[in-house]
């Protein structure tokens, strides 16, 4: 807290300019009017104040706006944004995407801070949904943003926003998140032709059900092993050897290297060894010839 002292003669700030950087903390407190500061916030960011000095300026703004800063001030906070606490940010009403971009720019290249997370939360809640422009902006600054959302939060993403998603944005998503995103992606890309559709839908396939994988197997898509390994195990298990062969195309040879890992391992255990042998890959662990497989889950459903 800076002690309140009278402003020395001739030092009263008439405008926010570079001379203020050489003011001591108490001089900033005494000689800079909070209302002047608020109206010339765009200039503050152009002056490389120390964080100690920014503390004084923040204190002045907090006194002027105890209920939270107006957006005209927020947009020009610059480095002062790094001084804000999540509690400060919860008082704000940020509606402009330009304001959001300006503040994310300050934090660019660093992990998402609690302040940024709070800011984004306030912004998205204010908009009511995660629209395409917002998603575009957020994933540009934080590629992992989408995967930091809960399935419930993801449910507010409109299908049209899915066009903004890049494959790397989904790298850290878990199956529960992909379960929510996949149907939206399917809807978003439904009017594309086969090969183009597959390119777009590929990174969302960790949420695809069996019937969609079966349909893809009829389209000569040549899915790579990395994508196959991210598929839901429960969606892969019902696929026949022939369907997997068609789905993977020339990449089917990669199954051998993955035979001990899920979902390949579990899928092998469900296939007849005879059928596996037709691949000529030496996959072992299938159901021996002559054995009858009873699907007990189906039996229970019927009784």
């Amino acid at each position: 807290e800076v002690e309140k002292t009278a402003c020395p003669s001739g030092k009263k700030a008439r405008e926010i300019d570079e001379s203020l950087i050489f003011y001591k903390k108490w001089e900033l407190e005494a000689c800079v009017d909070a209302a002047l500061l608020a109206t010339q916030m765009d200039r503050v960011n152009a002056i490389p104040f120390t964080y100690e000095q920014l503390d004084v300026l923040k204190h002045k703004l907090d006194e002027l706006y105890p209920q939270g800063y107006p957006e005209s001030v927020i947009q020009h906070l610059g480095y002062l944004f790094l001084k804000m606490s999540p509690e400060d940010i919860r008082k704000w009403n940020v509606t402009s995407l330009e304001t959001l971009k300006a503040l994310l720019e300050v934090n660019k290249g660093h992990e998402m801070s609690p302040q940024v997370a709070t800011l984004i939360d306030r912004f998205v809640k204010g908009r009511g949904q995660l629209d395409k422009d917002t998603l575009d902006t957020l994933t540009a600054f934080y590629p992992g943003y989408l995967c930091s959302l809960s399935p419930e939060e993801l449910s507010s993403v409109p299908p049209s926003s899915i066009w903004a998603v890049r494959p790397q944005d989904l790298d850290t998503c878990d199956p529960r998140q992909l379960d929510v995103l996949y149907p939206k992606a399917r809807l978003a890309f439904q009017n594309m032709n086969g090969s183009e559709y597959f390119v777009k839908i590929q990174s969302f396939l960790g949420g695809a059900p069996t019937e969609d994988l079966k349909a893809l197997s009829q389209q000569n898509v040549s899915m790579d092993l990395a994508t196959f390994m991210k598929l839901r195990t429960d969606a892969v298990l019902p696929l026949t050897v022939a369907e997997v062969q068609k789905l993977l195309g020339p990449h089917v040879e990669g199954l051998k290297a993955e035979e001990r890992h899920r979902p390949v391992r579990d899928w092998i255990l469900r296939q007849r060894q005879d059928d596996l042998d037709t691949l000529g890959l030496g996959l072992q662990g299938g159901i021996p010839n002559g054995y009858l497989v009873l699907d007990l889950s189906m039996q229970e459903a019927l009784s």
């Epitope: 490389p48 120390t50 964080y51 480095y79 001084k83 290249g109």
Partner: nanobody, 116 residues
Framework: EVQLVESGGGLVQAGGSLRLSCVAS????????MYWHRQAPGNERELVAY???????NVADSVKGRFTISRDNSKNTLYLQMNSLRAEDTAVYYC???????????WGQGTLVTVS
């Protein structure tokens, strides 16, 4: 975090020159602006000069025309060239930096300049 070590201080006669250096280490890629401050015995600390990552610099009126600040990013080093030194320039000179990653100023331990 960023660590700062100043050097180059010492005893000099009025009218003489000194060149202070400040070497930064640690997360130097996050450094934005670098500053020289000074604190004379019994006085408050005051900002003497600064230089931004873009090369913009300025010095306080009290040292204008005598002190020059510069920065060598490849060596992570900040300099303060002090000419025409006066008795009132006697102080402990501190280097500090502002980073883009953490909202506190990082400080060196200071180097003493005595002008007789």
């Amino acid at each position: 975090e960023v660590q700062l070590v100043e050097s180059g201080g010492g005893l000099v006669q009025a009218g003489g020159s000194l060149r202070l250096s400040c070497v930064a280490s640690g997360r130097t890629s996050t450094i934005d602006t670098m500053y020289w401050h000074r604190q004379a015995p019994g006085n408050e600390r005051e900002l003497v000069a600064y230089v931004t990552s873009r090369g913009t610099s300025n010095v306080a009126d009290s040292v204008k025309g005598r002190f020059t600040i510069s920065r060598d990013n490849s060596k992570n080093t900040l300099y303060l060239q002090m000419n025409s030194l006066r008795a009132e320039d006697t102080a402990v000179y501190y280097c500090s930096v502002r980073t883009t990653s953490y909202p506190v100023d990082f400080w060196g331990q200071g180097t003493l300049v005595t002008v007789s």
